[in-house]
């Protein structure tokens, strides 16, 4: 234990300032993004060192579900994080320097709502205080953008292709290539979040191939080329 | 009580890497920095930079993140710190340091000593 | 980077006597907290670094209160009363405001 290192703090005669909590009204990022919810605050115990709690929570004020929480020893400028909603949240600030600013990553629409700081001293100076108006975030949807298109080897000397997009609402995918009828059956893969994957599992013909990515604000295309070198039977491609 | 313990002397051949480590006992290890520092003989003191062991978030100097990778075995409760293509610039007493406003302690430092 | 810099590279004094360690800054380390982000350390000779004074004007865990911190956003200084044979060594302040930290040159305490 060692509880009996603790160091001494000194008293100062500088007037103590009020429990109070900056943060703006509200914060814009598009879907796919990531958005910084900034929270700074004042408190009364100038020199507290003992140990505290970050939370954030999202919908209302005091009883919303927490979307992320950290804690941090005595004399500690590390905020261990005990709950991150999905791993997409993470502490930017230092609590110990009145900032629990927060970054959530890959944002949905569905993030889109008000969210709310709250610090806890949970020492001898048992105290806390939580932002009563929140910041709201406004995640805007974004149109669909293909973020990687490959060929890749298959079985028995095959190939596949591969497509993934992203977009809010996340993207419908199709495959359109030189084989007879054109457009070919896609595999809809599972995405996450705002990510979709598709796979071509067969490509029976050179030539190229096209994947289309399409949501309510857009549609966007990318193509893959197939050439295979086609040398004396038995040998491989 | 805090106690913070590294490795012993190390002598290396310029362009080879070598990994030191600090154990630490007395206190919770995954709650606090650890910080590393280096001193050359006759000189100052540099921070390298500093490691959560518990959440793995890493500071580095920019002037040591090509030299110096730490990293930190909450098992163990040691954290290490490898330092890659040593010159002669490299050699020195490096220190770890953690505990309460992550100086508190200090271990009894690592001398690295590149020569051919 | 913030540069810290400690001018006087040694500082004789008289056990018994009182002797002042300065430091500067190059920026406020001031925090908008309130807080002022300076350490103290005392290296003895063949020692590691001790901590001696946190936050510009703390006395760390275990230090003898004839050690006390003081300044303003970019002048520090340490003050040490009553100096002691055990005092001697080197001094060094540093900043933890930003990233890099920084430390200063050093200011090597010698008993006349």
């Known amino acids: 234990d060692a509880s009996g290192d603790l160091l001494n703090t000194e008293a100062h005669s500088a007037p103590a300032q009020r429990w109070s909590m900056q943060v703006p009204a509200e914060v814009n990022a598009e879907a796919g993004d990531a958005a910084v919810l900034p929270c700074t605050f004042t408190h009364p115990h100038r020199h507290y060192d003992g140990p505290l709690t970050a939370i954030w929570r999202s919908g209302e004020p005091y009883a919303g579900p927490q979307v992320f929480r950290c804690t941090a020893a005595p004399g500690s400028e590390l905020c261990q994080t005990a709950l991150s909603l999905h791993g997409r949240f993470r502490l930017l600030g230092n609590p110990r320097r009145n900032d629990l600013s927060l970054r959530v990553e890959r944002l949905a629409l569905a993030d889109s709502g008000r969210y709310f700081c709250r610090v806890e001293f949970t020492g001898d100076a048992h105290d806390r205080y939580e932002s009563r108006h929140g910041v709201r975030l406004r995640v805007t949807a974004a149109a669909p953008r293909i973020v990687n298109i490959s060929v890749l080897p298959g079985p028995a000397h095959a190939f596949r292709a591969l497509c993934t997009a992203e977009g809010e609402p996340p993207p419908a995918l199709a495959w359109s290539g030189p084989a007879p009828g054109n457009s070919s059956a896609a595999l809809q893969g599972q995405g996450h979040g705002y990510q979709v994957t598709a796979e071509l599992p067969a490509l029976t013909r050179d030539g190229r191939y096209t994947c289309t990515a399409a949501n309510s604000l857009g549609r966007a295309e990318a193509s893959v080329y197939l050439f295979r070198f086609h040398g004396a039977p038995g040998t491989s491609t | 009580q805090v106690q913070l313990k590294q490795s012993g002397p190390e002598l290396v051949r310029p362009g080879a890497s070598v990994k030191i480590s600090c154990e630490a006992s007395?206190?919770?290890?995954?709650?606090?920095?650890v910080n590393w520092v280096k001193q050359r003989p006759g000189r100052g003191l540099e921070w390298i930079g500093k490691?959560?062991?518990?959440?793995?978030?890493?500071y580095y100097n920019e002037k040591f993140k090509d030299k110096a990778t730490l990293t930190a075995d909450k098992s163990s409760s040691t954290a290490y710190m490898q330092l890659s293509g040593l010159t002669s610039e490299d050699s020195a007493v490096y220190f770890c340091?953690?505990?309460?406003?992550?100086?508190?302690?200090w271990g009894q430092g690592t001398l690295v000593t590149v020569s051919a | 980077d913030i540069v810290m810099t400690q001018a006087a590279p040694s500082v004789p004094v008289t056990p018994g006597e009182s002797v002042s360690i300065s430091c500067r800054s190059s920026k406020s380390l001031l925090h908008s907290n309130g807080n002022t982000y300076l350490y103290w350390f005392l290296q003895r000779p063949g020692q590691s670094p001790q901590l001696l004074i946190y936050?510009?004007?703390n006395l760390a865990s275990g230090v003898p209160d004839r050690f006390g911190g003081s300044g303003s956003g970019t002048a520090f200084t340490l003050r040490i009363s009553r100096v002691e044979a055990e005092d001697v060594g080197v001094y060094y302040c540093m900043q933890h405001l930003e990233y890099p930290y920084t430390f200063g040159g050093g200011t090597k305490l010698e008993i006349k």
């Open positions: 936050r510009m004007s």
């Open positions: 340091a953690s505990y309460y406003y992550g100086f508190a302690y």
């Open positions: 007395g206190y919770t290890f995954t709650d606090y920095y």
């Open positions: 490691i959560g062991p518990g959440s793995v978030s890493i």
